[in-house]
Structures are given as structure tokens and as C-alpha cells.
């Protein structure tokens, strides 16, 4: 469909509330340091302009693309160069290069302080101005997560508002709010990581990589739907995510709504698990579909070998309709294996493809590919064994101990990576234990490997900004589906030149005593990484002793009447002790 005014079309489709929310998210994701009030002003101006276009699509500038309109707004900010430096250089470019330039300046690790929820102050804000409260939430999440899936953020903002509607009436606001906010925070962080991986797969590996990922995932979730149906959804979903990852948030939200409508209209041929989703309002409906439970497998599934090994036309199909044939294979394999991770399914499809590529050029192809399914077993065994070993380690050490074991493992593999990144990534990798190890056997593999893909993507995104390790670059860029096996296979870096011992790194102050438990852990884990960078060959025993002594030293000083004086006296002694243990 062609419209005279794209902005008017989107405004009419989305309605004023969602339109304003999405425009706010778009500006917040691009200008991550601007104060909220500045963004509100921009949103107001864009909304007023959109309304004039709705009234008269032929009005001046209404025919301009949304990229042009948004870009012009950004470039009109007087303090752009002062606050954003070379982002202002983008303004010298024409569309579409200007928009590409803005996208490249998105910062995945902005220097923005962590949000600390204060229940009393938040309830006061909520009760004073609900609309502003909703907008502020969108702004704070969007600026910290510049690739957050915009329509999904609108959903979380509704949930956030609901939490406050309930808890601000409660006698003990904090007791009601804090656990709910924490639970929501975890969901939001997972959602951010999932979307970041989707955007990375589209941007770094192309649309086909994303389509393959989606095909496997949807085939697992909707095994009753036929290949043609799944393919249609995959194509539409790829368009939605391409738009959101590209900053086309209005189009993305509009297309996502259309896709939810299509899925609900055709739920009979897609899945039996969508009924309750489809009765919900738009944002909840889309969220519910995305999180829908796996449907039961059809009872009459035939052995895969019929179609993909025994059939005489395998090579004909492979040569004449390669992508469709491999897609059919991935669909059929995935719907039969809800227990496998998406990455594992894609690795299996890659092996199948490589085998056909080789065999179909040979004299007797069927004899050559007859045993192709036997090649899949080692691919399945590798992550299964790894998960078994790591879950046993997690059970033995607990979450904090398991995180420390991973800090040691990863610092030895890639010691060049910055200390904050190593701590963040290893801590997140360590959470796989509590997330997945308690799950039933048939859920463990997909839970663990799909979660690890999210965390390793975070490492890749951060490392790309300031590359310091060839090993990390290699694992991140060679193959999306083999990232996890690539990192697992890395051995300690024997070429690394140890860092000089810097006493300041191991200087602690009284503030350590009042920190929340997780921040205390981060301080200790930061010291552990620095220790390993100084002594990469430190033994497990030495590290355990140092950590034990550190805990005792902190406990002693935090129990002393004058914390700071104790740290000043005991700190230097502790440093001497460390050096002695590691000598």
C-alpha cells in the first residue's frame, strides 16, 4: 500500500498513545544521554506534526519519510555536537546514509548509573502524573538498551504501571513493590538480551541467518503447523525485526500487530496453545504469542529418513531448490526435537548441508549420504556432556562459587578482555546454573545453550566496540551457531604477558561494608580477575586462599568501630599477604 504521508498512516494505525511511546523510545535509543524533558519536547513536536498530516496529508513535509523527519529533528538539536561528539557528523550525510550513521552510534554500554528503586519516591511520582511515570520508564529502559524491542517495551511499561497501581495502595509499599520490580527487571533484561541477539544476527550474519533461527524456533513451538505456514510467519517476523533493529519502530510495531492478527486468524492451523493469547488486547496478545507454550507433536510423524536419506530425489531437491529443501529439513528436524537448542538444530542442518554438498557431486550420492544421520550424534553429545559437567559443578559450588569458577576459566582463556566485561559476562554465564540445572532433563539442553547464546552475544557486542582479543573476534564472527562451542573449546592463553601488580587495584574502603550483596560480590570478583591477569598460572588452591583471606579481611574491617581506619591499616597488610601467597 502506498500512502501520501507515512507519518499520518502510522499515527492512524497505532493511535496517539502508542505513537508517542514509540517516538519516545526511538529518540531515547539514539540520544542516550539527553534528559527526559528534552525528549518529551521532541515527542510533542513530532506528535503535533503527525496530527497536522492526519488532518491534511498534502501539508508541507508530510510526504517525507519517517527517517528524514526523525533525522531532521535530531540534527536540529543545538547541543548535539557538545553532548554527542561525532554523532553530529551524521547530520552532514543524506538519507539513507544518515540513518545508518545514527545506528552505528548507538552505545550498548552507556555510562548511565544503575536504577535504584525508592518505593516511596516512585509511588509519589506515580500518583502525581501517571502519564509522565509511564514515559519515564520507557525513556530509562530505552536509553540503557538501545536495541530493546520497542513494541515489547510498551508491553512491559503497562505491566510496570500495573505493579504501581497495586502496590502504591499497600500499607507496606516496599514489601509489595521490590520483589515485583526485581522480577520484572529480570524479565526486561532477558528480553533486551534476546532482542540484541536477534539484531546482531540480522546485522552481522544477514537476514537468512535470522530466518533460519526463527524457522527452527517456530517449528519447535508450533509442530502442528505445516512448513508453508511456518515459512510465511518466518518471513513476516524477519521483516518486523529488521525494522525494529534498523530503528523503524513505528513500522515495526504496526507490522507486529498485523502478524499477531494473522496468527490469531489462522490459529487453527498453527497451534492449539494460542486460544487465550488471542483473546487479549494487542500488546498482551503479541507478548503472549511470542511466549506461547510448545504445542504437542502430531501423533503421525514419520521417520525423517524417508524424506531426507532414503529418497532418490534428495540431490535433485538439494540442487534445484537448495534453500527450500534445507528449510524443510530444518523444519522437520526441529519439530521433532523440542528438547534441542536452536543453535544445535542449526549445527545439525549445517552438517546435513555440508554432507549433501559433498555427496551430490559424487558418483553414488545415496551411498555417500546414507549415514548422514549418524554424524549428528557427536553434535548432540558435546553440549549434553558439557551441561552435565557444569551442572554438577554448580550443585557443588553454589551460584557464587560457580561464577568464580567461570571467572577463572574465562580470564585464563581471554585475559586481554577488560575486567568489567569479564566480570559481567562470567557472572551472567554463572546464572545458567540456577536458570537451567534444576529443569527436567528434556529442557536442560535448550535452556542452557539458548541462554549462553544470549550471554556470549553480549560479550561479542562489547568486544566489537573495543577489540582486544583475536580469539574473541574469531569466535564472535566466524559462525553465529558455533559461538558457544568455539568459546568452550578455547584453552588458556599461553601467549599472554601478565599485567604488572598495581596496588591500587587491591585498595578497599569503608563503602564496601554498606554495599548490597551483589555489588560486594562484584568487587571481590573484580579483584579475582585482576589477580589472574597478574598471575595467570595461579593454582586453584592459591586463589581459594586469597579469596578466603579477602573475605576475612572485609569481615574484620566491617565489624571494626572505625571501618575506614581499619581498611587503611589492614589493606596494605592484605596486599603483602596476596603477594606472598602468589609468589
Amino acid at each position: 500500500d502506498t500512502y501520501k504521508s507515512e507519518i499520518a498512516h502510522r499515527f492512524k494505525d497505532l493511535g496517539e498513545q502508542y505513537f508517542k511511546g514509540l517516538v519516545l523510545i526511538a529518540f531515547s535509543q539514539h540520544l542516550q544521554q539527553c534528559p527526559y524533558e528534552e525528549h518529551v519536547k521532541l515527542v510533542r513536536e513530532v506528535t503535533e506534526f503527525a496530527k497536522t498530516c492526519v488532518a491534511d496529508e498534502s501539508a508541507e513535509n508530510c510526504d517525507k519519510s519517517i527517517h528524514t523527519l526523525f533525522g531532521d529533528k535530531l540534527c536540529a538539536i543545538p547541543s548535539l555536537r557538545e553532548h554527542y561528539g561525532d554523532l553530529a557528523d551524521c547530520c552532514e550525510k543524506e538519507e539513507p546514509e544518515r540513518n545508518e550513521c545514527f545506528l552505528q552510534h548507538k552505545n550498548d554500554n552507556p555510562d548511565i548509573p544503575k536504577l535504584k528503586p525508592d518505593p516511596v519516591a516512585l509511588c509519589a511520582d506515580f500518583q502525581e502524573d501517571e502519564q509522565k511515570f509511564w514515559g519515564k520508564y520507557l525513556y530509562e529502559i530505552a536509553r540503557r538498551h538501545p536495541y530493546f524491542y520497542a513494541p515489547e517495551l510498551l508491553y512491559y511499561a503497562i505491566i510496570y504501571k500495573d505493579v504501581f497501581s497495586e502496590c502504591c495502595q499497600a500499607a507496606d509499599k516496599a514489601a509489595c513493590l521490590l520483589p515485583k520490580i526485581e522480577h520484572l527487571r529480570e524479565k526486561v533484561l532477558t528480553s533486551a538480551a534476546k532482542q540484541r541477539l536477534k539484531c546482531a544476527s540480522i546485522q552481522k550474519f544477514g537476514e537468512r541467518a535470522f530466518k533460519a533461527w526463527s524457522l527452527a524456533r517456530l517449528s519447535q513451538r508450533f509442530p502442528k503447523a505445516d512448513f508453508t505456514e511456518i515459512s510465511k510467519i518466518v518471513t513476516d517476523l524477519a521483516k518486523v525485526h529488521k525494522e525494529c533493529c534498523h530503528g523503524d519502530l513505528l513500522e515495526c510495531a504496526d507490522d507486529r500487530a498485523d502478524l499477531a492478527k494473522y496468527i490469531c486468524e489462522n490459529q487453527d492451523t498453527i497451534s492449539t496453545k494460542l486460544k487465550e493469547c488471542c483473546d487479549k488486547p494487542l500488546l498482551e496478545k503479541s507478548h503472549c504469542i511470542a511466549e506461547a507454550k510448545r504445542d504437542e507433536l502430531p501423533a503421525d510423524l514419520n521417520p525423517l529418513e524417508h524424506d531426507f536419506v532414503e529418497d532418490k530425489e534428495v540431490c535433485k531437491n538439494y540442487k534445484e531448490a537448495k534453500h527450500v529443501f534445507l528449510g524443510t529439513f530444518l523444519y522437520e528436524y526441529s519439530r521433532r526435537h523440542p528438547d534441542y537448542s536452536v543453535s544445535l538444530l542449526l549445527r545439525i542442518a549445517k552438517i546435513y548441508e555440508a554432507t549433501l554438498e559433498d555427496c551430490c557431486a559424487k558418483e553414488d550420492p545415496p551411498a555417500c549420504y546414507a549415514t548422514v544421520f549418524d554424524k549428528f550424534q557427536p553434535l548432540v553429545d558435546e553440549p549434553k556432556n558439557l551441561i552435565k559437567q557444569n551442572c554438577e559443578l554448580f550443585e557443588k559450588l553454589g551460584e557464587y562459587g560457580f561464577q568464580n569458577a567461570l571467572i577463572v576459566r574465562y580470564t585464563k582463556k581471554v585475559p586481554q578482555v577488560s575486567t568489567p566485561t569479564l566480570v559481567e559476562v562470567a557472572r551472567k554465564l554463572g546464572l545458567v546454573g540456577s536458570r537451567c540445572c534444576k529443569r527436567p532433563e528434556e529442557e536442560r539442553l535448550s535452556c542452557a545453550e539458548d541462554y549462553l547464546s544470549l550471554v556470549l552475544n553480549r560479550l561479542c557486542v562489547l568486544h566489537e566496540k573495543t577489540p582486544v582479543s583475536e580469539k574473541v573476534t574469531k569466535c564472535c564472527t566466524e559462525s553465529l551457531v558455533n559461538r558457544r562451542p568455539c568459546f568452550s573449546a578455547l584453552t588458556p592463553d599461553e601467549t599472554y604477558k601478565p599485567k604488572e601488580f598495581v596496588e591500587g587495584t587491591f585498595t578497599f574502603h569503608a563503602d564496601l561494608c554498606t554495599l548490597p550483596e551483589d555489588e560486594k560480590q562484584i568487587k571481590k570478583q573484580t579483584a579475582l580477575v585482576e589477580l589472574l591477569k597478574h598471575k595467570p598460572h595461579a593454582t586453584e588452591e592459591q586463589l581459594r586462599t586469597v579469596l578466603g583471606n579477602f573475605a576475612a579481611f572485609v569481615q574484620k574491617c566491617c565489624a571494626a568501630p572505625d571501618h575506614e581506619a581499619c581498611f587503611a591499616v589492614e589493606g596494605p597488610k592484605f596486599v603483602i599477604e596476596i603477594r606472598g601467597i602468589l609468589a
Epitope: 505445516d226 505456514e229 524417508h306 524424506d307 532418490k312 531437491n317 531448490a321 527450500v324 524443510t328
Partner: nanobody, 126 residues
């Protein structure tokens, strides 16, 4: 529910020609993998020819290659089998079969096709 209805069978002399038709309802024939099978008295049902859905790939059993041609008319939602140089061993009941939601003929196994017509008899005899 997909329904298939064959027509065009009959008695023909060796070396002669026949054109079978299969009218489909309940599915778009251009989006569905469709095939012709045949069953001679006392024998198993065997694959004759097939055509992919959404991808124009045709498939033939070795015994009919060069003699039979499978095609479809999307506007009429109909599948055809043009049979030339017919032989007595081509005598059988010919069935049209569909595997909706499948773009390719990835199998010649009759059991994997959920939808079948009632068949049309072709007799090749002098």
C-alpha cells in the same frame, strides 16, 4: 479439508496418449506438493510423477521419464498428467495425491501423502 477428483482415464491402444486431470479443492495446488501414483492389480501403489508447490520442480519415476509430463493450471486449481507412448505395463488405477504445506516432493512413499483422490482407471491394450 483437501479434496481431489481425478478424471480422463479410459481404454487406449499401445503407443497412444491420454491426459489425466485432478481437480483440487480446499488447498491451492500451486502451494502444495502433488503427485500421481498408480496401482496395477495385485501390485503395490507406486509413484509416477510429482510437482513441487511454489517451486517448479518436476519428478518422474524412471519407468515413465520422457513419456509422461506432469503440469498444473493454477487458475483452475488442477493438476494434469500427459501420458504419451503408452505401454501395456502402464495399465493401472491412477491416483492423485497431495501433501499440503510441503513445497517439495521429498518422498515417494505413498503413506506420507495424507490426501488422495478416488482414482481413475487407465487400460492400455490392443
Amino acid at each position: 479439508e483437501v479434496q481431489l477428483l481425478e478424471s480422463g482415464g479410459g481404454l487406449v491402444q499401445p503407443g497412444g496418449s491420454l491426459r489425466l486431470s485432478c481437480a483440487a479443492s480446499g488447498a491451492y495446488i500451486d502451494e502444495t506438493a502433488v503427485a500421481w501414483f498408480r496401482q496395477a492389480p495385485g501390485k503395490e501403489r507406486e509413484f509416477v510423477a510429482g510437482i513441487g508447490g511454489g517451486v517448479d520442480i518436476t519428478y518422474y519415476a524412471d519407468s515413465v521419464k520422457g513419456r509422461f509430463t506432469i503440469s498444473r493450471d493454477n487458475s483452475k486449481n488442477t493438476l494434469y498428467l500427459q501420458m504419451n507412448s503408452l505401454r501395456p505395463e502402464d495399465t493401472a488405477v491412477y491416483y492423485c495425491a497431495a501433501r499440503p504445506g510441503r513445497p517439495l516432493i521429498t518422498s515417494k512413499v505413498a503413506d506420507l501423502y495424507p490426501y488422495w483422490g478416488q482414482g481413475t482407471l487407465v487400460t492400455v491394450s490392443s
